[in-house]
Amino acid sequence: IPTEIPASALVKETLALLSTHRTLLIANETLRIPVPVHKNHQLCTEEIFQGIGTLESQTVQGGTVERLFKNLSLIKKYIGGQKKKCGEERRRVNQFLDYLQEFLGVMNTEWIIESH
Amino acid sequence: IPTEIPASALVKETLALLSTHRTLLIANETLRIPVPVHKNHQLCTEEIFQGIGTLESQTVQGGTVERLFKNLSLIKKYIGGQKKKCGEERRRVNQFLDYLQEFLGVMNTEWIIESH
């Protein structure tokens, strides 16, 4: 993401553009896109961006909807950068366990885990 | 995940086991494991479970520490199932946009986005 656009501002602007162009984006009534069936969004980034690609290929260009797709592409790049940072630093077991505990803690409190 | 263990209970039990066996797990002081450098845990599930695999191969098995790794393997399976559900259902653009908006909304409010 270009340093002149903080990721948080980019996400906010993208949300606004998404809302602005909704009518235009839903014009294609026959198009079907895979939609995750749970709310653990971060697990589904690949599928979300594949869906965005499908949508972009079916959407007219020329207007500010192009800005929306450009932003989404920057967000994809940002997330790609975050994924690279998942395995960049090798640390002591202690620190790995801290992270694992945090991960399970987040799973425990924030994940939407459907009851069986 | 076996129906007799709800995922939420499994996570809780795993957290307790992790805390119990911490001293045993950190015994290997030379071992280095990749640790994500940000807190968007769901993006890093692959690396986390690779780390768990490394740790398991270096840990003396037996007793309840085996139970810990069995649980972690079930959680991995659960997450794999969730990932499969990312692209299972094809829906209208409208529903995809709802999900995308929700994803960006969560990014906006809950993700830890480092400032540039």
Epitope: L24, Q58, G62, G63, T64, E66 | -
Partner: antibody, heavy 116, light 106 residues
């Protein structure tokens, strides 16, 4: 009220350069894209190119690459179309229009006559 | 680039008559936009996204089509509909216009 006011008719010599302007009122050009179109006497419409005034990003039709330069000044809410090395083939009416969600508002056109 | 061919180039219709003009694309496009232009005036956006009428366009106008074949229809011709109609694609650069259909009143 949304309006695009274009500069007045121009009569120029072959080989000269000219800059046409398109001044917006009732909206901020940064929130839209501005396009330019050429219409030769008794002929159809030709897309010249467009600018995203928010960042200066431009795209041109291949026929106008190197011939036409599109710029924008957000402080005066104005877009410009500059031509170099004019020939009689450039004699036409030039229109600007805005494209937000839809290409909805056009200027009144600037007639350009290239003649010795 | 995508070439749009409009036909007929020139047509005339009597008041009350149904009018159909077509726009054919050299390769598949998602949508077609239509503009109306009268002499000494700027083009006016007329139909968006193949079938959505622009603000103020009378309901006797309709647009349809998909892929490479599109059309604009006037259910009952009126004198004020006499104009040139252009189709345009926003599918890929460069954005191209059709050559236009000039509609005259008989």
């Amino acid at each position: 009220e949304v309006q695009l006011q274009q500069s007045l008719a121009e009569l120029v010599r072959p080989g000269a350069s000219v800059t046409l302007s398109c001044t917006a009122s009732g909206f901020n050009i940064k929130n839209t894209y501005i396009h330019w179109v050429k219409q030769r006497p008794e002929q159809g419409l030709e897309w010249i190119g467009r600018i995203d005034p928010a960042n200066g990003d431009t795209k041109h039709g291949p026929k106008f690459q190197g011939k036409a330069t599109i710029t924008a000044d957000t402080s005066s809410n104005t877009a410009y179309l500059q031509f170099s090395s004019l020939t009689s083939e450039d004699t036409a009416i030039y229109y600007c229009f805005r494209y937000g969600i839809y290409p909805d508002h056009w200027g009144q056109g600037t007639p350009l006559t290239v003649s010795s | 680039q995508i070439v749009l061919t409009q036909s007929p180039a020139l047509m005339s219709a009597s008041p009350g008559e149904k009018v159909t003009m077509t726009c054919s694309a050299s390769s598949s496009v998602n949508y077609i936009y239509w503009y109306q232009q009268k002499p000494r005036s700027s083009p006016k956006p007329w139909i968006y996204l193949t079938a959505t009428l622009a603000s103020g366009v009378p309901a006797r106008f309709s647009g349809s089509g998909s892929g490479t074949s599109f059309s604009l229809t006037i259910s009952r011709m009126e004198a004020e509909d006499a104009a040139t109609y252009y189709c345009q694609q926003w599918n890929s650069y460069p954005y191209t216009f059709g050559g236009g259909t000039k509609l005259e009143i008989e």
